[in-house]
Interface confidence: medium
Amino acid sequence: MAVTACQGLGFVVSLIGIAGIIAATCMDQWSTQDLYNNPVTAVFNYQGLWRSCVRESSGFTECRGYFTLLGLPAMLQAVRALMIVGIVLGAIGLLVSIFALKCIRIGSMEDSAKANMTLTSGIMFIVSGLCAIAGVSVFANMLVTNFWMSTANMYTGMGGMVQTVQTRYTFGAALFVGWVAGGLTLIGGVMMCIACRGLAPEETNYKAVSYHASGHSVAYKPGGFKASTGFGSNTKNKKIYDGGARTEDEVQSYPSKHDYV
């Protein structure tokens, strides 16, 4: 029951996390900037991974996509790549984990197969979460070091027009969404990996005890009952090695050369 709960909760947490990663990737508010602020009008510029927007206190809003790939900084391209990889891995992980859920029965799927699928999806969620956290952190670092405005000229591909005023950008809402979403996906992945351990079928769920004859000179007649292994008979009338009572962890439960002296 605890395993099912852990697996189910891990799936739900990861699902919320991946939805958050998708939302953060699509959001325009990765970085925000107060361009102009006076009692009459305020103009805000905010930028995402795919486009730049301007919003005025009057209600006017305009967004424009980045015109070129070549003119954009490599760091921005790296952040885009990390977020997309995170989404793809997360989506595959979700698909795998649906079939791995203990509460869902698909044909005659073995518990071991479900355990493997749970582990696979868990690892995918962990990597997905790490990708999102890394992507958001790289972008945040760009803002902190003021690398964004010095390198990412939004007018590239438009005749090289430069911005006349350069002011510092601040963290946008998408960064916080990305961090939280990445963390949730990571936690969900860890929960799936923990659930995998409980799903994996154990070799023996209890300690079976084999009882052996205690006497050193006891010989059994042909066809007699062999107490130590429960297989066959002692046809050669040889003494049975006295090992006393031992658990199945200590002795093999099938006849081998070690059973006889």
Partner: nanobody, 122 residues
Framework: EVQVQESGGGLVQAGGSLRLSCAAS????????VGWFRQAPGKEREFVAA????????NYADSVKGRFTISRDNAKNTAWLQMNSLKPEDTAVYYC???????????????WGQGTQVTVSS
């Protein structure tokens, strides 16, 4: 390199109309938003109107809303500012500018014309 040139300014009676033109050279004109700004003697440059690169959205200063209309034709590389019901306080040098956004923020505009004088007499 994009260059912009204003024309159509002049002297007009209060309540009259005037149409300013902004002609741009350069194939990338359609990539830019076009904004109109004005500067009266002894005053700061103020935003008048702007139009997005596609012409799909416009932005006006409260003082000119309902009186001025901005439009553009990307095929002709030209933008216009139709000014109706002119008032003496509209007297200023009118500047056309090309920028990334159709915002009231002058820092957004990288390309500026020399300006054209509009005088409204009472």
């Amino acid at each position: 390199e994009v260059q912009v040139q204003e024309s159509g300014g002049g002297l007009v009676q209060a309540g009259g109309s005037l149409r300013l033109s902004c002609a741009a050279s350069g194939r990338t004109f359609s990539n830019y938003a076009v904004g109109w700004f004005r500067q009266a003697p002894g005053k700061e440059r103020e935003f008048v109107a702007a139009i997005t690169w596609s012409g799909g959205s416009t932005n006006y200063a409260d003082s000119v809303k309902g009186r001025f209309t901005i439009s553009r034709d990307n095929a002709k590389n030209t933008a216009w500012l139709q000014m109706n019901s002119l008032k003496p306080e509209d007297t200023a040098v009118y500047y056309c500018a090309g920028g990334f956004f159709a915002t009231s923020y002058s820092g957004n505009y990288g390309y500026w014309g020399q300006g054209t004088q509009v005088t409204v007499s009472s």
